[in-house]
Interface confidence: medium
Protein backbone atom coordinates (compact mmCIF):
# COMPACT_ATOMS: atom_id res chain seq x y z
CA UNK A 1 0.00 0.00 0.00
CA UNK A 2 1.50 3.32 -1.15
CA UNK A 3 0.99 4.73 2.82
CA UNK A 4 3.27 1.98 4.06
CA UNK A 5 6.08 4.01 2.89
CA UNK A 6 5.28 7.07 5.08
CA UNK A 7 4.52 4.85 8.24
CA UNK A 8 6.71 5.78 11.12
CA UNK A 9 9.19 2.88 12.04
CA UNK A 10 7.17 2.62 15.79
CA UNK A 11 3.33 2.98 16.42
CA UNK A 12 2.36 6.36 18.04
CA UNK A 13 -1.29 6.67 19.03
CA UNK A 14 -2.57 10.14 19.37
CA UNK A 15 -5.66 11.13 21.27
CA UNK A 16 -7.99 12.95 19.10
CA UNK A 17 -7.99 17.04 20.14
CA UNK A 18 -11.23 17.61 22.46
CA UNK A 19 -13.48 19.72 20.77
CA UNK A 20 -14.19 22.59 23.33
CA UNK A 21 -17.71 21.84 23.02
CA UNK A 22 -17.58 18.55 24.44
CA UNK A 23 -15.98 19.74 27.75
CA UNK A 24 -18.07 20.26 31.15
CA UNK A 25 -19.36 23.96 31.95
CA UNK A 26 -22.47 25.64 33.54
CA UNK A 27 -23.72 29.38 34.23
CA UNK A 28 -25.93 29.49 37.00
CA UNK A 29 -27.92 32.95 37.41
CA UNK A 30 -29.26 34.16 40.14
CA UNK A 31 -32.91 33.18 42.11
CA UNK A 32 -34.86 34.81 44.83
CA UNK A 33 -33.38 33.44 47.95
CA UNK A 34 -35.58 32.28 51.22
CA UNK A 35 -32.79 33.29 54.17
CA UNK A 36 -32.82 31.26 56.72
CA UNK A 37 -31.29 31.70 60.63
CA UNK A 38 -27.65 31.08 60.90
CA UNK A 39 -25.29 31.74 63.30
CA UNK A 40 -22.92 34.89 61.93
CA UNK A 41 -20.06 32.99 61.33
CA UNK A 42 -22.09 30.92 58.96
CA UNK A 43 -21.84 32.30 55.86
CA UNK A 44 -25.01 30.45 53.91
CA UNK A 45 -24.88 28.93 50.51
CA UNK A 46 -27.08 30.79 47.65
CA UNK A 47 -29.03 28.77 45.41
CA UNK A 48 -29.32 29.36 41.50
CA UNK A 49 -31.28 29.16 38.41
CA UNK A 50 -29.73 26.49 36.28
CA UNK A 51 -31.73 26.05 33.23
CA UNK A 52 -33.87 29.18 32.45
CA UNK A 53 -32.61 32.35 30.32
CA UNK A 54 -29.10 32.40 30.50
CA UNK A 55 -28.34 29.51 32.40
CA UNK A 56 -27.18 26.40 31.29
CA UNK A 57 -25.61 22.82 32.46
CA UNK A 58 -23.55 21.12 29.72
CA UNK A 59 -21.70 17.79 29.63
CA UNK A 60 -22.06 15.93 32.92
CA UNK A 61 -21.76 19.26 34.35
CA UNK A 62 -24.95 18.99 37.33
CA UNK A 63 -26.30 21.55 39.40
CA UNK A 64 -28.25 20.19 42.38
CA UNK A 65 -29.14 21.64 46.29
CA UNK A 66 -26.50 24.86 45.49
CA UNK A 67 -23.75 22.45 44.71
CA UNK A 68 -22.36 22.60 40.83
CA UNK A 69 -21.29 18.74 40.94
CA UNK A 70 -17.77 18.20 39.11
CA UNK A 71 -17.89 15.59 36.47
CA UNK A 72 -14.32 14.70 35.71
CA UNK A 73 -10.77 15.67 37.09
CA UNK A 74 -9.28 18.56 35.61
CA UNK A 75 -8.12 22.52 35.78
CA UNK A 76 -11.39 24.54 35.83
CA UNK A 77 -11.85 28.21 35.70
CA UNK A 78 -14.54 29.60 38.40
CA UNK A 79 -16.09 32.49 38.85
CA UNK A 80 -19.09 34.13 40.38
CA UNK A 81 -20.63 37.75 40.88
CA UNK A 82 -22.79 38.60 43.20
CA UNK A 83 -24.69 42.26 43.62
CA UNK A 84 -25.23 43.35 47.14
CA UNK A 85 -28.08 46.00 47.72
CA UNK A 86 -29.20 48.08 50.46
CA UNK A 87 -30.85 51.02 51.59
CA UNK A 88 -28.66 52.91 53.86
CA UNK A 89 -25.17 52.09 55.55
CA UNK A 90 -23.85 55.01 57.39
CA UNK A 91 -21.99 53.50 59.94
CA UNK A 92 -23.56 55.42 62.80
CA UNK A 93 -27.21 53.78 62.13
CA UNK A 94 -25.56 50.37 60.94
CA UNK A 95 -25.91 48.62 64.74
CA UNK A 96 -30.00 49.68 65.62
CA UNK A 97 -30.66 49.04 69.41
CA UNK A 98 -27.40 47.19 69.93
CA UNK A 99 -28.17 44.90 67.14
CA UNK A 100 -26.00 44.11 63.97
CA UNK A 101 -29.09 44.05 61.83
CA UNK A 102 -26.87 45.74 59.06
CA UNK A 103 -23.64 44.66 58.46
CA UNK A 104 -20.63 46.64 57.95
CA UNK A 105 -19.10 44.98 55.09
CA UNK A 106 -20.21 41.89 52.87
CA UNK A 107 -18.96 38.90 51.75
CA UNK A 108 -18.38 36.35 48.70
CA UNK A 109 -17.03 33.10 49.07
CA UNK A 110 -16.74 30.12 46.73
CA UNK A 111 -16.30 26.99 48.36
CA UNK A 112 -15.36 23.42 47.65
CA UNK A 113 -16.47 20.69 49.39
CA UNK A 114 -15.01 17.27 48.81
CA UNK A 115 -16.61 14.08 50.29
CA UNK A 116 -13.30 12.72 51.43
CA UNK A 117 -12.42 15.94 53.46
CA UNK A 118 -14.19 16.95 56.60
CA UNK A 119 -13.89 20.87 56.09
CA UNK A 120 -14.93 22.56 53.06
CA UNK A 121 -12.23 24.50 51.47
CA UNK A 122 -12.43 28.21 50.98
CA UNK A 123 -11.28 28.70 47.40
CA UNK A 124 -12.07 32.79 46.76
CA UNK A 125 -13.01 35.01 48.72
CA UNK A 126 -13.92 38.77 47.82
CA UNK A 127 -14.83 41.48 51.12
CA UNK A 128 -16.49 45.48 50.65
CA UNK A 129 -17.08 47.78 53.34
CA UNK A 130 -20.16 49.37 52.60
CA UNK A 131 -19.92 51.95 55.00
CA UNK A 132 -18.73 54.64 53.10
CA UNK A 133 -21.28 54.18 50.01
CA UNK A 134 -24.36 56.21 49.73
CA UNK A 135 -27.66 55.55 51.23
CA UNK A 136 -29.49 53.51 48.37
CA UNK A 137 -26.30 51.10 47.49
CA UNK A 138 -25.04 48.27 45.01
CA UNK A 139 -22.14 46.66 45.21
CA UNK A 140 -20.65 43.95 43.21
CA UNK A 141 -18.61 41.39 44.33
CA UNK A 142 -16.50 39.22 41.27
CA UNK A 143 -14.33 36.13 42.03
CA UNK A 144 -13.07 33.79 39.04
CA UNK A 145 -9.40 32.09 39.54
CA UNK A 146 -8.46 28.74 38.16
CA UNK A 147 -8.34 25.34 40.03
CA UNK A 148 -7.88 21.59 39.90
CA UNK A 149 -10.58 19.67 41.32
CA UNK A 150 -11.30 15.97 41.04
CA UNK A 151 -14.38 14.39 40.00
CA UNK A 152 -16.64 14.38 42.88
CA UNK A 153 -15.59 17.55 43.79
CA UNK A 154 -18.91 20.17 45.05
CA UNK A 155 -18.72 23.54 44.60
CA UNK A 156 -21.11 26.71 46.16
CA UNK A 157 -21.38 30.38 46.53
CA UNK A 158 -21.68 31.65 50.09
CA UNK A 159 -22.45 35.11 51.04
CA UNK A 160 -22.27 36.71 54.29
CA UNK A 161 -25.65 38.15 54.46
CA UNK A 162 -28.26 36.57 51.99
CA UNK A 163 -30.88 39.03 52.34
CA UNK A 164 -28.66 41.40 50.62
CA UNK A 165 -28.19 39.68 47.25
CA UNK A 166 -29.90 41.21 44.34
CA UNK A 167 -32.10 39.23 42.65
CA UNK A 168 -33.74 41.34 40.43
CA UNK A 169 -31.64 40.78 37.09
CA UNK A 170 -29.55 37.35 36.16
CA UNK A 171 -26.64 39.91 34.61
CA UNK A 172 -26.55 41.10 38.02
CA UNK A 173 -25.57 37.58 40.05
CA UNK A 174 -23.97 34.70 38.37
CA UNK A 175 -21.65 31.23 39.41
CA UNK A 176 -20.28 29.62 36.63
CA UNK A 177 -17.26 26.79 36.18
CA UNK A 178 -16.48 25.13 32.52
CA UNK A 179 -13.32 22.54 32.29
CA UNK A 180 -10.32 24.51 30.60
CA UNK B 1 -46.91 34.76 80.75
CA UNK B 2 -44.11 32.83 78.36
CA UNK B 3 -43.45 29.76 79.37
CA UNK B 4 -41.73 26.36 78.21
CA UNK B 5 -42.45 23.11 80.01
CA UNK B 6 -39.86 19.92 79.04
CA UNK B 7 -41.44 16.33 79.13
CA UNK B 8 -40.34 12.73 78.61
CA UNK B 9 -37.09 12.28 80.74
CA UNK B 10 -36.37 9.49 82.02
CA UNK B 11 -33.88 6.11 83.14
CA UNK B 12 -33.18 4.46 79.88
CA UNK B 13 -30.64 1.61 78.92
CA UNK B 14 -27.50 2.33 76.44
CA UNK B 15 -28.62 2.29 73.44
CA UNK B 16 -32.19 2.99 73.56
CA UNK B 17 -33.98 5.94 72.44
CA UNK B 18 -36.33 8.33 74.35
CA UNK B 19 -37.82 11.23 72.92
CA UNK B 20 -38.10 14.90 74.86
CA UNK B 21 -41.20 17.17 74.34
CA UNK B 22 -41.01 20.92 75.36
CA UNK B 23 -44.53 22.80 74.83
CA UNK B 24 -44.43 26.41 74.45
CA UNK B 25 -47.11 28.71 75.91
CA UNK B 26 -47.58 32.67 76.05
CA UNK B 27 -45.83 33.87 72.62
CA UNK B 28 -46.32 32.96 68.86
CA UNK B 29 -44.20 29.95 68.77
CA UNK B 30 -43.67 29.82 65.25
CA UNK B 31 -41.90 32.91 64.99
CA UNK B 32 -39.07 32.19 67.48
CA UNK B 33 -35.73 29.36 67.26
CA UNK B 34 -35.44 26.69 69.79
CA UNK B 35 -32.49 25.64 70.88
CA UNK B 36 -31.72 22.61 73.68
CA UNK B 37 -29.26 22.82 76.13
CA UNK B 38 -28.01 20.23 78.45
CA UNK B 39 -26.31 19.86 81.95
CA UNK B 40 -23.90 17.01 83.25
CA UNK B 41 -24.70 16.07 86.77
CA UNK B 42 -22.19 18.78 88.64
CA UNK B 43 -21.23 19.99 85.31
CA UNK B 44 -21.85 23.14 83.43
CA UNK B 45 -23.97 24.07 80.28
CA UNK B 46 -24.00 22.46 77.30
CA UNK B 47 -25.27 23.44 73.93
CA UNK B 48 -26.88 20.46 72.18
CA UNK B 49 -29.21 21.41 68.74
CA UNK B 50 -31.00 24.38 67.50
CA UNK B 51 -34.11 24.95 64.75
CA UNK B 52 -35.06 27.18 63.32
CA UNK B 53 -38.13 29.59 63.36
CA UNK B 54 -39.39 27.71 59.84
CA UNK B 55 -37.53 24.60 60.71
CA UNK B 56 -35.22 24.53 57.53
CA UNK B 57 -32.29 24.93 59.73
CA UNK B 58 -31.31 22.37 62.25
CA UNK B 59 -27.91 22.03 63.81
CA UNK B 60 -26.57 19.89 66.33
CA UNK B 61 -23.02 19.76 68.46
CA UNK B 62 -20.75 17.39 67.24
CA UNK B 63 -21.37 14.40 70.05
CA UNK B 64 -25.09 14.26 68.76
CA UNK B 65 -25.00 14.53 65.39
CA UNK B 66 -26.56 11.06 63.83
CA UNK B 67 -27.75 10.19 66.54
CA UNK B 68 -30.35 13.30 68.07
CA UNK B 69 -32.89 14.82 65.64
CA UNK B 70 -34.70 18.30 66.47
CA UNK B 71 -37.59 19.16 65.27
CA UNK B 72 -40.61 21.15 65.85
CA UNK B 73 -44.86 21.17 65.07
CA UNK B 74 -45.71 24.75 65.21
CA UNK B 75 -49.81 23.63 65.32
CA UNK B 76 -48.73 22.03 68.73
CA UNK B 77 -46.64 24.72 69.87
CA UNK B 78 -44.35 21.62 70.56
CA UNK B 79 -40.54 21.16 70.22
CA UNK B 80 -39.19 17.75 70.07
CA UNK B 81 -35.64 16.10 70.45
CA UNK B 82 -35.83 12.35 69.81
CA UNK B 83 -32.44 10.68 70.84
CA UNK B 84 -31.39 7.62 69.53
CA UNK B 85 -27.96 5.13 70.30
CA UNK B 86 -27.96 6.80 73.95
CA UNK B 87 -25.09 6.92 75.58
CA UNK B 88 -23.80 7.21 79.14
CA UNK B 89 -22.31 10.48 78.61
CA UNK B 90 -25.61 11.81 77.75
CA UNK B 91 -27.21 11.95 81.08
CA UNK B 92 -27.92 15.17 82.21
CA UNK B 93 -30.51 17.66 83.01
CA UNK B 94 -32.23 18.60 79.32
CA UNK B 95 -33.76 22.50 78.51
CA UNK B 96 -35.35 23.43 75.86
CA UNK B 97 -34.82 27.10 75.67
CA UNK B 98 -35.96 29.58 72.93
CA UNK B 99 -34.23 32.40 70.82
CA UNK B 100 -34.75 35.93 70.83
CA UNK B 101 -34.88 35.81 67.09
CA UNK B 102 -34.61 39.43 66.85
CA UNK B 103 -34.55 39.15 62.85
CA UNK B 104 -34.97 36.01 61.14
CA UNK B 105 -31.60 35.73 59.72
CA UNK B 106 -29.21 35.54 62.89
CA UNK B 107 -29.41 33.39 66.36
CA UNK B 108 -28.90 35.23 69.23
CA UNK B 109 -28.98 33.11 72.01
CA UNK B 110 -31.33 31.99 74.80
CA UNK B 111 -33.99 34.25 76.47
CA UNK B 112 -36.35 32.23 77.78
CA UNK B 113 -35.91 28.36 79.19
CA UNK B 114 -37.63 26.06 80.62
CA UNK B 115 -37.50 24.17 84.17
CA UNK B 116 -35.53 20.68 82.60
CA UNK B 117 -36.33 17.43 82.19
CA UNK B 118 -33.65 14.49 83.13
CA UNK B 119 -32.30 11.52 81.25
CA UNK B 120 -30.65 9.29 82.95
CA UNK B 121 -28.78 6.31 80.98
CA UNK B 122 -27.44 3.34 83.11
CA UNK B 123 -27.75 -0.20 82.65
CA UNK C 1 -14.92 25.99 67.92
CA UNK C 2 -14.70 28.72 70.06
CA UNK C 3 -12.88 28.80 72.93
CA UNK C 4 -14.67 30.30 76.09
CA UNK C 5 -12.13 30.66 79.29
CA UNK C 6 -14.46 32.11 82.53
CA UNK C 7 -12.63 33.46 85.47
CA UNK C 8 -12.47 33.09 88.35
CA UNK C 9 -14.21 29.81 88.52
CA UNK C 10 -15.13 30.23 91.95
CA UNK C 11 -15.08 33.23 94.31
CA UNK C 12 -16.50 33.99 97.92
CA UNK C 13 -17.95 37.57 98.61
CA UNK C 14 -19.89 39.21 101.29
CA UNK C 15 -23.53 40.96 100.79
CA UNK C 16 -23.11 44.75 99.53
CA UNK C 17 -19.20 43.59 97.74
CA UNK C 18 -18.58 44.46 94.24
CA UNK C 19 -18.56 41.19 91.93
CA UNK C 20 -16.41 41.05 89.28
CA UNK C 21 -16.35 38.04 86.40
CA UNK C 22 -14.44 37.80 83.56
CA UNK C 23 -14.80 35.98 80.48
CA UNK C 24 -12.50 35.70 77.36
CA UNK C 25 -12.99 34.35 73.66
CA UNK C 26 -10.48 32.66 71.58
CA UNK C 27 -11.79 34.45 68.38
CA UNK C 28 -13.58 38.28 67.93
CA UNK C 29 -17.33 37.77 68.59
CA UNK C 30 -17.88 41.12 68.29
CA UNK C 31 -20.59 41.84 70.89
CA UNK C 32 -22.97 38.71 70.76
CA UNK C 33 -22.21 37.55 73.94
CA UNK C 34 -24.53 37.18 76.96
CA UNK C 35 -24.84 36.58 80.90
CA UNK C 36 -26.66 33.75 82.66
CA UNK C 37 -27.43 33.01 86.75
CA UNK C 38 -28.19 29.68 87.61
CA UNK C 39 -29.38 28.50 91.02
CA UNK C 40 -29.10 25.19 92.42
CA UNK C 41 -32.28 23.28 90.90
CA UNK C 42 -33.34 25.50 88.95
CA UNK C 43 -33.39 26.85 84.98
CA UNK C 44 -30.66 29.06 84.10
CA UNK C 45 -31.64 32.78 83.72
CA UNK C 46 -30.54 35.18 81.13
CA UNK C 47 -29.08 38.90 82.72
CA UNK C 48 -27.34 40.76 80.01
CA UNK C 49 -27.91 40.47 76.46
CA UNK C 50 -25.19 42.19 73.50
CA UNK C 51 -22.76 41.99 75.55
CA UNK C 52 -24.03 45.25 78.15
CA UNK C 53 -27.54 45.14 77.80
CA UNK C 54 -29.81 44.63 80.65
CA UNK C 55 -32.43 42.20 79.94
CA UNK C 56 -35.49 43.34 80.87
CA UNK C 57 -36.78 42.15 84.83
CA UNK C 58 -33.35 42.38 85.76
CA UNK C 59 -31.62 44.41 88.50
CA UNK C 60 -29.48 47.29 87.74
CA UNK C 61 -26.81 46.20 90.10
CA UNK C 62 -26.15 43.86 86.94
CA UNK C 63 -24.20 45.06 84.23
CA UNK C 64 -22.11 44.14 81.35
CA UNK C 65 -19.39 45.48 79.09
CA UNK C 66 -16.77 44.17 76.80
CA UNK C 67 -16.73 43.55 72.80
CA UNK C 68 -14.46 41.23 70.89
CA UNK C 69 -12.56 38.78 72.57
CA UNK C 70 -13.04 40.18 76.43
CA UNK C 71 -16.14 40.71 78.47
CA UNK C 72 -17.09 41.68 82.28
CA UNK C 73 -20.24 41.27 84.54
CA UNK C 74 -20.17 42.92 87.23
CA UNK C 75 -22.25 42.81 90.26
CA UNK C 76 -22.03 46.21 92.07
CA UNK C 77 -23.72 45.36 95.44
CA UNK C 78 -23.99 41.93 95.97
CA UNK C 79 -26.97 40.95 97.36
CA UNK C 80 -28.03 37.61 99.44
CA UNK C 81 -29.97 36.59 95.78
CA UNK C 82 -26.94 36.57 93.96
CA UNK C 83 -25.42 33.79 95.66
CA UNK C 84 -25.27 31.44 92.41
CA UNK C 85 -23.71 30.01 88.93
CA UNK C 86 -23.10 32.61 86.43
CA UNK C 87 -22.03 31.35 82.62
CA UNK C 88 -21.11 33.51 79.73
CA UNK C 89 -22.34 32.48 76.40
CA UNK C 90 -21.52 33.50 73.08
CA UNK C 91 -23.84 32.84 69.99
CA UNK C 92 -21.62 34.68 67.25
CA UNK C 93 -20.20 31.20 65.60
CA UNK C 94 -21.65 27.71 65.02
CA UNK C 95 -21.52 26.13 67.90
CA UNK C 96 -22.52 28.60 70.66
CA UNK C 97 -20.56 27.98 73.49
CA UNK C 98 -20.72 28.56 77.48
CA UNK C 99 -18.28 29.73 79.40
CA UNK C 100 -17.14 27.17 82.40
CA UNK C 101 -19.02 28.74 85.31
CA UNK C 102 -18.00 31.06 88.10
CA UNK C 103 -19.66 30.31 91.43
CA UNK C 104 -20.68 33.12 93.87
CA UNK C 105 -20.56 31.69 97.05
CA UNK C 106 -20.88 33.92 100.18
CA UNK C 107 -17.83 34.46 102.66
Known amino acids: LKGQEFAPSHQQVYAPLRADGDKPRAHLTVVRQTPTQHFKNQFPALHWEHELGLAFTKNRMNYTNKFLLIPESGDYFIYSQVTFRGMTSECSEIRQAGRPNKPDSITVVITKVTDSYPEPTQLLMGTKSVCEVGSNWFQPIYLGAMFSLQEGDKLMVNVSDISLVDYTKEDKTFFGAFLL | QVQLVESGGGVVQPGRSLRLSCAAS????????MHWVRQAPGKGLEWVAVISYDGNNKLYTDSVKGRFTISRDDSKSTLYLQMNSLRAEDTAVYYC????????????????WGQGTTVTVSS | DIQMTQSPSSLSASVGDRVTITCRTSQDIRDDLGWYQQKPGKAPKRLIY???SLQSGVPSRFSGSGSGTEFTLTISSLQPEDFATYYC?????????FGQGTKVEIK
Open chain 3, 50 to 52: DAS
Open chain 2, 97 to 112: ARDPTVTLYYYYGMDV
Open chain 3, 89 to 97: LQHNSYPPT
Open chain 2, 26 to 33: GFTFSSYG
